[in-house]
Every structure is written in structure tokens, then in C-alpha cells.
């Protein structure tokens, strides 16, 4: 999670403020180090599918999780803050059986009004034999998922079935996709905001409208802010998502919801069933769909995927491969930015961003998306320098 | 059940305006677009424009463009058009109608009960 | 913007006979494989009432006698068999963008 592509030895952190290296016993220690401080903000993390909240513990230079012992809910507020979330996201939070955990973090409630990370010790016993889990927005929940579901070989999509899925115009015309993962946030690939769209004042999110012709600019969210990846490449599209923040926040409904970031320990399976949405053209070479369109496809494991028949070493651990390698369903041209999603424990979960392909739906060139299991940390960092 | 609650009739003098109200019960007032229509006696239905409760921000017929300005109240969950200087033209039945923008369709499938403006001096 | 006209301007149907009323748009309200041309009936002092959406498909509640047809421009409305409270003005409208027109109407009246 935190330590993915530090340019730092395995044993040292990387300051994002300054590039300098720490040592891990001096993360979260209570001491800022990195210039910026962000060594004593990026303590926490939700685990796994169900959402485990981990605090980092200096001592043990490692991942523990949060026993419920004493805990409250101004606390959750407090963790979900520190990711990047606002108050007003929070969701709820919930306690899970972990007695497979032999290591916690448990609150010290007589260390007074100090910061939450203070408070917190490591313990090998947790009492109520419960792990603190935080939903820090309500995420990843939809009305009805498609039909077997054009992009290229999907079907049109049902009202409310991927409320995350915004159309982003410049100029009234739809450019790329993208997915809500807060009433102020959207992630798209980075490619789609390449210069001149780099700057907020082309664009204009449409959200909760399935239809093309519906999308008039009085019912647009205008962007205030457009960031890309600092290492997006786009030669080889490494790299590719990019954030831009709305003007106003998003009113949620039953057609206007976010995706959930996926969390680290969420294991991807080969042959992992996933669903692509987007306005993209529903044949290569054609045109913007006017409907919303969404269509199954699989997970293709990296190393089939960078197989000399397949996209021969194009593929790097930034990137995630779906579709068919027999061809027929795939996303498009005008798909890109948009998302690729996968259901587990009932919650929908945003895996990938559309970024490339060699043309579209063609045998063995299965479409490539943005592994945004690589980015939350990049994203959590945005959202948190955003305040 | 879903409603849209409108008031029976206005009586207004020629030059002034009138606010028409359309409370809606029901339903998630944000997931609609709210639309208006209006119909003159014994005539066609025509459209006025809708508006976008999320947003707000309206989208107009051409021909309405001066005459009616739409609004909502989200915490009252009710839909407002104002028509301003009034001629006996604007003498007609208003409807507001809902729309299910989310859907691919864009058809009216609740609508108000309609409201008579009447503008005589 | 799509210019809807309708077919007759009134008609006098017998009970139990076949009503036919044909809607024609300007250019095709059909796209994505789907025709955006809707229904509703109207009876005096009430407000409008939908009953076919997408060209064929019924409204819940909407008795079977009346059934949708057609794409691209043109479109009809069937009722068969006609009941004395089918007597109402019937207006087509599409959706296939903003803004959205109505056709005049066409008034059905029994003989």
C-alpha cells in the first residue's frame, strides 16, 4: 500500500515533500521527519474486503488493526479524516470477529486529549475479540446491475445500475469516462487529460444520465480541478489516471453514487468476472453511443497478457488486462477514463480505469485499465493535501 | 404514494407575474428532473422546460426563455415557475411532470394535477 | 427541434371497433435500438396520462386494447377494442433529445 513504487531501499519510506528517505521506525512515530510531515498523516488504512481499519505501528514496522475495545464513532470520524475523507462522507462502522489476529492496536483512553495515533499502543490481547471496521463513505452499492450487458459486445445499461459512471464533455461533446468516488471526486485516466485538457474550465461531469442527448450543460458539474499522475508516460500509458475534483459536490441518489477504492489485501483472481461501462463507440471506428452501455468481461492475468501472441511485454504492474482473448467484447474509443468493476461481499469495487488497447474487441488484444490498486495511496494523498 | 401537488388556480393581472408551486411526495425528489408544460383551453400541450433538482440550473423551450423562470426547494421538495409580465396569452393550465432522467426513455410518467392561471384585469 | 404531426385531428369510432391514430416526427427519434416516441391519453379537466413508452411498450396499469408500433418516423397507437371510456384526446411525444415535442392531439369520440 504505502510502500509501492517508493525509489527508496526496502528498507526506508520515501518523504513525498522532499523525495528523502526515512526509516520505517520512524514512520508514525509521533515525530514529524518528512518536510511536509506526511510521515505522521498516512497512518492508517482500511484492509480487505471488509474494510479492517490498520494503523501503522513504528515499533513493529508493520500493519496492525484497530481493536474495538473503547472504541467510538468520533474516532472513526478521525481515522477516515486522515485518509482524505471529509466528515461528512462518513458512513458508519462496524466491528468483525478477527480472532485470527494475535497482534492489535488498542487505545490508551486515560492518555487524555491527545491525537488518535497517540492514544493507540500495540497489544497481543484484544478483549472483545473484535477488529474495528469503518466504511468512511457509503460505496460501491447499486440498483440493479445490466443486462448481460455495447461498448463493444455489451448491451445498454439500466437506470441506477452504475452510478458511479460519469460522461465528461469539453465543449458539450462526451471525451472520456470517468467514476465517482466522492461527492467532490472522480477518477479517469490520465491520457484523457492530456494538454490542453489539462486544464479544469474544458470540463463538464454529467452524472446519473444514461442518454447522450439528456446531457445539457445546466445539469453538468463543472471541474475545478484537474491532477494527473506525475509518472504518467504516454507513450506506453504508464501510469494512467489522473483525479479532477468538482466545483460543487455531487447530490447522491438512487442514480448518482460512488464506487469504492479497492483496499489493500483485496486479492484479484485470474478469470476474475468484471463489468466496463461507457458511451464509447460500440464498433472500432464508430461513433459515441448515445446510451450508456456496459458489458462483462474477465480478468486477464499479467503474464498471459504480456505473452508474445498477446501485447508482448507492454504490460507493467500499472496496468490490468480484461476482456476475451477470442475478441468480441471490449471497451472503445470514447470508453477511456471509465470504469472497470468487480462485486465482492455485495459492494462494487473500482480495479481499473479504461486506458488502451490495440484496437477494439480484436482476438488477443484484450483492453488494458489503469490498476488503480496501485493508485489509492496517490489518490488518498490528493485528497488529503486537497483538505 | 407518488404526487405532485399543485394549486387548483391564480388569478393575476395583466403586466405582473406568478409564482406556481409543485410539491412533490413520494419519491427521491433528486433522482427526477421536473418538466412544464403548458396547455391553453382547448388546445395542445407544450413544453415549457425542466430543471434539474440536483443541479438547478434550468434548460429552457426558446419561446419560454423570458417568460418563465424555474426553481427548486430541495429541503421542501418542491419545484417553482414564475411567469412574469403577463398577457391573456399566458392564460392556460400548468403542469409539472416528472422525468426519470436516470432512465434512457424521457417519458412523463407522474403528472401535477395543473394549475389555471387566469390574467384578466 | 422534432416536429411531431398527428393523424387524424379527430375520429369517430363505434364501441368494440379499432381506433387508429398515427403520429409522424420530422426526422427519426430512433437511435441506439431504441424508438423514444411515447403516448398518454387525456380526458377533460385531467391532467395527462402515459400509456405506451418507447413506441410499444404498456404502462402498468394500462388496459392490453391498447398497443404501439413503429421506428424512425413513423408511429401508431391502436386501440381495439374501443370502450365508451376511451373516449379522450391522445397526444404522441418524443424524447429523442431536448427539447422534447408533443404532437396537436387527436381527439377520439364514439359514434
Known amino acids: 500500500w504505502k510502500f509501492m513504487g517508493s525509489k527508496c531501499s526496502n528498507s526506508g519510506i520515501e518523504c513525498d515533500s522532499s523525495g528523502t528517505c526515512i526509516n520505517p521506525s520512524n514512520w508514525c512515530d509521533g515525530v514529524s521527519h518528512c518536510p511536509g510531515g506526511e510521515d505522521e498523516n498516512r497512518c492508517v488504512r482500511l484492509y480487505g474486503p471488509n474494510f479492517i481499519l490498520q494503523v501503522y505501528s513504528s515499533q513493529r514496522k508493520s500493519w496492525h488493526p484497530v481493536c474495538q475495545d473503547d472504541w467510538n464513532e468520533n474516532y472513526g470520524r478521525a481515522a477516515c479524516r486522515d485518509m482524505g475523507y471529509k466528515n461528512n462522507f462518513y458512513s458508519s462502522q462496524g466491528i468483525v470477529d478477527d480472532s485470527g489476529s494475535t497482534s492489535f492496536m488498542k487505545l490508551n483512553t486515560s492518555a487524555g486529549n491527545v491525537d488518535i495515533y497517540k492514544k493507540l499502543y500495540h497489544s497481543d490481547a484484544c478483549s472483545s475479540k473484535a477488529v474495528v471496521s469503518l466504511r468512511c463513505i457509503a460505496c460501491g452499492v447499486n440498483l440493479n446491475s445490466s443486462r448481460q450487458s455495447r461498448i463493444v459486445g455489451g448491451e445498454s445499461a439500466l437506470p441506477g445500475a452504475w452510478p458511479w459512471q460519469v460522461s465528461l464533455h469539453v465543449q458539450n461533446v462526451h471525451v472520456c469516462g470517468g467514476s465517482i468516488i466522492t461527492p467532490e471526486w472522480i477518477v479517469t485516466a490520465a491520457h484523457c487529460v492530456e494538454k490542453p485538457l489539462n486544464n479544469p474550465w474544458h470540463w463538464t461531469a454529467f452524472a446519473g444520465i444514461l442518454r447522450q442527448s439528456f446531457m445539457f450543460y445546466g445539469a453538468g458539474y463543472q471541474v475545478e480541478k484537474v491532477i494527473s499522475h506525475p509518472n504518467y508516460d504516454s507513450k506506453t500509458k504508464n501510469n494512467d489516471i489522473a483525479l479532477m475534483k468538482l466545483q460543487k459536490p455531487l447530490t447522491f441518489n438512487d442514480l448518482v453514487k460512488p464506487v469504492c477504492l479497492p483496499n489493500p489485501g483485496m486479492m484479484l483472481q485470474p478469470e476474475q468476472l468484471c463489468w466496463i461501462s461507457g458511451w464509447g463507440a460500440t464498433e472500432e471506428k464508430g461513433k459515441t453511443s448515445e446510451v450508456l452501455n456496459a458489458a462483462k468481461v474477465l480478468l486477464i492475468e499479467t503474464q498471459r497478457c504480456n505473452s508474445r501472441y498477446v501485447y508482448d511485454n507492454l504490460i507493467t504492474p500499472a496496468m490490468i488486462c480484461a476482456g476475451f482473448l477470442q475478441g468480441n467484447v471490449d471497451s472503445c474509443q470514447g470508453d477511456s477514463g471509465g470504469p472497470l468493476v468487480t462485486s465482492k461481499n455485495n459492494i462494487w469495487w473500482l480495479i481499473g480505469d479504461t486506458s488502451w488497447g490495440s484496437g477494439c474487441a480484436k482476438a488477443y488484444r484484450p483492453g488494458v485499465y489503469g490498476n488503480v490498486m496501485v493508485f489509492t495511496d496517490w489518490i488518498y494523498r490528493q485528497m488529503r493535501a486537497d483538505g | 404514494q407518488v404526487q405532485l401537488q399543485q394549486p387548483g388556480a391564480e388569478l393575476a393581472k395583466p403586466g405582473a407575474s406568478v409564482k406556481l408551486s409543485c410539491k412533490a411526495s413520494?419519491?427521491?425528489?433528486?433522482?427526477?428532473?421536473m418538466h412544464w408544460v403548458k396547455q391553453r383551453p382547448g388546445q395542445g400541450l407544450e413544453w415549457i422546460g425542466l430543471?434539474?433538482?440536483?443541479?438547478?440550473?434550468?434548460n429552457y423551450n426558446e419561446k419560454f426563455k423570458s417568460k418563465a423562470t424555474l426553481t427548486v426547494d430541495k429541503s421542501s421538495r418542491t419545484a417553482y415557475m414564475q411567469l412574469s409580465s403577463l398577457t391573456s396569452e399566458d392564460s392556460a393550465v400548468y403542469y409539472c411532470?416528472?422525468?426519470?432522467?436516470?432512465?434512457?426513455?424521457?417519458?412523463?410518467?407522474?403528472w401535477g394535477t395543473g394549475t389555471t392561471v387566469t390574467v384578466s384585469s | 427541434d422534432i416536429v411531431l404531426t398527428q393523424s387524424p385531428a379527430s375520429l369517430a369510432v363505434s364501441l368494440g371497433q379499432r381506433a387508429t391514430i398515427s403520429c409522424r416526427a420530422s426526422?427519426?427519434?430512433?437511435?441506439?435500438?431504441?424508438?423514444?416516441m411515447h403516448w398518454y391519453q387525456q380526458k377533460p379537466g385531467q391532467p395527462p396520462k402515459l400509456l405506451i413508452y418507447?413506441?410499444?411498450n404498456l404502462e402498468s396499469g394500462v388496459p392490453v386494447r391498447f398497443s404501439g408500433s413503429g421506428s424512425g418516423t413513423d408511429f401508431t397507437l391502436n386501440i381495439h377494442p374501443v370502450e365508451e371510456e376511451d373516449a379522450a384526446t391522445y397526444y404522441c411525444?418524443?424524447?429523442?433529445?431536448?427539447?422534447?415535442?408533443f404532437g396537436a392531439g387527436t381527439k377520439l369520440e364514439l359514434k
Open positions: 411532470a416528472r422525468w426519470d432522467y436516470g432512465s434512457s426513455y424521457g417519458y412523463f410518467d407522474v
Open positions: 413520494g419519491y427521491t425528489f433528486t433522482s427526477y428532473w
Open positions: 430543471i434539474p433538482p440536483n443541479s438547478g440550473s434550468s
Open positions: 426526422e427519426s427519434v430512433s437511435t441506439s435500438g431504441y424508438s423514444y
Open positions: 418507447l413506441a410499444s
Open positions: 411525444q418524443h424524447s429523442r433529445e431536448l427539447p422534447p415535442t
